[in-house]
């Protein structure tokens, strides 16, 4: 019967008595930076080319005995998970292995850097089809390793890495913390985060998604026909590398941004039990388990968006946090969140020729997060329209006045320490769909975009008194681009998008003794692209 | 024994290749920074990645590496260039004493220096 992990990543339409989705990634080359591997194992023979690259430190300990099967164990298993004949994800993918980890599974940042450079030079000398680089390793945060990954990603290479097995914030490790890398956490057959001894999978905002990573059957270097079960975020990353290879084989022109958005879009949503994660990390950790798309082509018509959380601002009065989208993505909205509720909103601003989302801490606050909604919108022309605080009137208003521009998000930023004492509602785009309305003491920022066939609408859901959280979701065929809260009182901790749902968090009414007049409303801006849908229909 | 001879050879070469023409000062206003792994047991002191500014050419990387060796040799330190990076990041990997970091950070074209550290199979 099909191993649990392959079943988990397979859409129902492919599920028969065996796993055999179409096109096994045959146009894609997957580079594996790991231990040495047993390349003639029956599972992977002829699929893995062992390069002559080797850069490893000496093994620790004077009595270390170099046993070939142990030296090859980790890499052989991962090669099998990516492209193994019987237990692999992308059975058609060809692989190239570089040895950067010694027989104890240990390597160096410098050896990994030289390995990445080797891949780049190979790519320049002999350009082939799409490249996926699998980095099933982790070290402490490294500026230089992250920088090298960024350069390789900008050269068109898809990098996939393990989140780490330290039951810790993945942002403290590299290459897991590199924004350009697809960082993968591990889940088990029950869709729970994987526990590994006293530790387990890493988590947090630097994780892009999770994938099967416990009791994964794959090639064993103990013998040429042996299989073994291994666990870890390396195994999870190998699944995503395989899925990426299959997606790229079906659509070789996909950019890294497009691939990442598709991986997120086709993942199983909200199946992970978040109670396993530390409380402060739950909101930051994506509740996504990787899966193959239901069909190899298509999906191009969809407006894809993802949520990007910033690092925490820190508690100082003037502290800010910035969330950035990838180079090929458009920032369509910006929101903020603070656990203490003390914040001064957020704004979209230009930085280095690109829009970023900046959130502002308030006096006495423990710090804020900026939350960017990053979308793939071809031929988009987006700008931010700002209205300074109106002060005298009932509220500040700003709208998208340019012909053909639609409102994709509203942000609000204020200098006063607490808007909670001022009653006028904040961020009410109701009435005129292309308008943001906010508090008279706040400056309001509207994200206005022109793109072929783009249409947007506002959806609201309010409840009489703060009850922890209010949500509103976009319906099928529409994509959430903006998420904000009404009103802007101190009860509201912030707003953020989770998949296609806008979540507004507020302090519990029982602890604040608030009255029903302080209702909380979640406001979603839902968009779709008729142009992308038509283009997709014409292709079919 | 073989390694020591290799280091000695590099030291001699470094002394011979010292050129007055290489003595331009680092650019004003930009201070190179030093980074190391926050997890102490994973640190590998004695090996450093010297990362140069983005547009630095290979020839400049090699020249900067030679200059570091020459200046270190004048102070009686042995250094060994293990690798010169180009293609992804400009820079070089050097085996040297941590005492030389201050000197290395002042070299022209240097953006930052990172102490090598361990990575592990996951």
């Amino acid at each position: 019967s099909i191993p649990w992990n392959l079943e988990r990543i397979t859409p129902p339409r492919y599920r028969a008595d065996e796993y055999q989705p179409p096109d096994g990634g045959s146009l894609v080359e997957v580079y594996l930076l790991d231990t040495s591997i047993q390349s003639d194992h029956r599972e992977i023979e002829g699929r893995v080319m062992v390069t002559d690259f080797e850069n490893v430190p000496e093994e620790d300990g004077t009595r270390f005995h170099r046993q070939a099967s142990k030296c090859d164990s980790h890499g052989t298993h991962l090669a099998g998970v990516v492209s193994g004949r019987d237990a692999g994800v992308a059975k058609g993918a060809s692989m190239r292995s570089l040895r950067v980890l010694n027989c104890q599974g240990k390597g160096t940042v410098s050896g990994t850097l030289i390995g990445l450079e080797f891949i780049r030079k190979s790519q320049l000398v002999q350009p082939v089809g799409p490249l996926v680089v699998l980095l099933p390793l982790a070290g402490g945060y490294s500026r230089v390793l992250n920088a090298a990954c960024q350069r390789l990603a900008r050269a068109g290479v898809v990098l996939v890495t393990a989140a780490g097995n330290f039951r810790d914030d993945a942002c403290l490790y590299s290459p897991a913390s590199a924004p350009e890398v697809i960082t993968v956490g591990a889940t088990n057959a029950q869709d729970q985060p994987v526990t590994l001894g006293t530790l387990g999978t890493n988590f947090g905002r630097c994780v892009d998604l999770f994938a099967p990573g416990e009791d994964i059957i794959g090639a064993s270097s103990d013998c040429s026909t042996c299989f073994v079960s291994q666990s870890g975020t390396s195994q999870a990353a190998a699944h995503v590398a395989g899925i990426a290879a299959m997606m790229l084989s079906a659509e070789p022109e996909l950019t890294l941004a497009e691939l990442r958005q598709r991986l997120i879009h086709f993942s199983a949503k909200d199946v992970i039990n978040e109670a396993w994660f530390p409380e402060d990390q739950r909101v930051l950790t994506p509740n996504l388990v990787a899966a193959l798309p239901p069909s190899t082509h298509g999906a191009g018509w969809q407006l894809f968006c993802r949520t990007v959380w910033s690092a925490h601002s820190g508690p100082t009065r003037m502290a800010t946090a910035i969330a950035r989208c990838a180079p090929d993505e458009e920032l369509l909205s910006c929101s903020s969140f603070s656990r203490s509720g003390k914040r001064r909103g957020e704004r979209m601003e230009a930085q280095g020729g690109k829009l970023v989302c900046r959130a502002h801490n308030a006096f006495g606050g423990e710090g804020v997060y900026a939350i960017a909604r990053c979308c793939l919108l071809p031929q988009a022309n987006c700008s931010v329209h700002t209205a300074p605080p109106a002060e005298a009137s009932m509220g500040t208003r700003v709208h998208c006045h340019q012909q053909g521009h639609v409102l994709t998000g509203c942000s609000s930023h204020w200098e006063v320490e607490d808007l909670g004492t001022h009653k006028p509602p904040v961020l009410r785009p109701r009435g005129q769909p292309n308008q943001c309305v906010g508090h008279r003491e706040a400056s309001i920022h509207a994200s206005c975009c022109h793109a072929p066939g783009l249409e947007c609408k506002v959806k609201e859901h309010g409840i009489p008194a703060p009850q922890g959280q209010v949500t509103v979701a976009c319906e099928e065929g529409w994509t959430l681009t903006g998420c904000s809260a009404l009103p802007g009182t101190s009860h509201v901790l912030g707003a953020y998008a989770v998949d296609n749902t806008c979540v507004v968090r507020s302090r519990d009414v029982s602890t604040t003794g608030s009255t029903s007049e302080e209702a909380v409303t979640a406001v979603a801006i839902c968009c779709r692209s008729r142009h992308l849908a038509q283009a997709s229909q014409e292709l079919q | 024994q073989e390694d020591e001879d290799g280091d000695y050879e590099e030291l001699v070469l470094a002394l011979r290749s010292e050129e007055d023409g290489l003595a331009e000062a680092p650019e004003h206003g930009t201070t190179a920074t030093f980074h190391r792994c926050a997890k102490d047991p994973w640190r590998l002191p004695g090996t450093y990645v010297v990362v140069l500014k983005e547009e630095t050419h290979l020839s400049q990387s090699e020249r900067t590496a030679r200059r570091l060796q020459a200046q270190a040799a004048r102070r009686g330190y042995l250094t060994k260039i293990l690798h010169v990076f180009h293609g992804l990041l400009p820079g070089f990997l050097v085996k040297m004493s941590g005492d030389l970091l201050e000197l290395a950070l002042k070299l022209p074209h240097v953006d930052y220096i990172e102490e090598d550290s361990s990575v592990f199979a996951q």
Epitope: E18, Q20, Q38, S39, D40, R42, E45, G46, V48, M49, V50, A68, R85, D86, K91, C223, S224, T225 | -
Partner: antibody
Framework: QVQLVQSGAEVKKPGASVKVSCKAS????????ISWVRQAPGQGLEWMGW????????NYAQKVQGRVTMTTDTSTSTVYMELRSLRSDDTAVYYC????????WGQGTTVTVSS | QSALTQPASVSGSPGQSITISCTGT?????????VSWYQQHPGKPPKLMIY???NRPSGVSIRFSGSKSGNTASLTISGLQAEDEADYFC?????????FGGGTKLTVL
């Protein structure tokens, strides 16, 4: 191109040993092992075992285990299959083939066991 | 006694399609994605025609196709030609070894 070239025909007496060679070329040797398959006259194919060019590990079929030894000489890219204590029913054409997938075959070596 | 069962012979006229079956167990054909088919002309070594159930090596005619259902694999040859007359063997992985079928003699009438 990928090629497996085998040694010439052998005639042996019962109880003797035979050693057949197979020289591989045209591909990365360590990416594949070598399988040995035999075919008795007018019969089907029988898999005898496999050897790794990468680390010399072997995997023998139960039927010949104890009588067969497969070895490699990486310097000449050659694999050897030695069969001991020959019997008349060992008379067959012996083939080497690339890997478990057996996608490329040698030309075959006829071994005749006769008193 | 071969581990995999094939019909001893099949025949067909030029232009017709024929199918050769290869039946095993869940420990071989049913348990692995690695069923291969070989063609062997008299006095020649076998030639790989299909690998991993349904994949064709380059150079093999698209008239040859493979499939699998449960513990039985099949080789189909469409548009039979005179040169297709040969012996055909299937093979499969087992947990630690390889097994072949007894072979099927294809006669093109």
């Amino acid at each position: 191109q990928v090629q497996l070239v085998q040694s010439g025909a052998e005639v042996k007496k019962p109880g003797a040993s035979v050693k057949v060679s197979c020289k591989a070329s045209g591909y990365t040797l360590t990416s594949y092992g070598i399988s040995w398959v035999r075919q008795a006259p007018g019969q089907g194919l029988e898999w005898m075992g496999w050897i790794s060019f990468y680390n010399g590990n072997t995997n023998y079929a139960q039927k010949v285990q104890g009588r067969v030894t497969m070895t490699t000489d990486t310097s000449t890219s050659t694999v050897y299959m030695e069969l001991r204590s020959l019997r008349s029913d060992d008379t067959a054409v012996y083939y080497c083939a690339r890997g478990y997938g057996m996608d490329v075959w040698g030309q075959g070596t006829t071994v005749t066991v006769s008193s | 006694q071969s581990a995999l069962t094939q019909p001893a012979s099949v025949s067909g006229s030029p232009g017709q399609s024929i199918t050769i079956s290869c039946t095993g167990t869940s420990s071989d054909v049913g348990g692995y994605n690695s069923v291969s088919w070989y063609q062997q002309h008299p006095g020649k070594p076998p030639k790989l025609m299909i690998y991993e159930v349904s994949n064709r090596p380059s150079g093999v005619s698209i008239r040859f196709s493979g499939s699998k259902s449960g513990n039985t694999a099949s080789l189909t040859i469409s548009g039979l030609q005179a040169e297709d007359e040969a012996d055909y063997f299937c093979s499969s992985y087992t947990s630690t070894s390889m097994v072949f079928g007894g072979g099927t003699k294809l006669t093109v009438l």
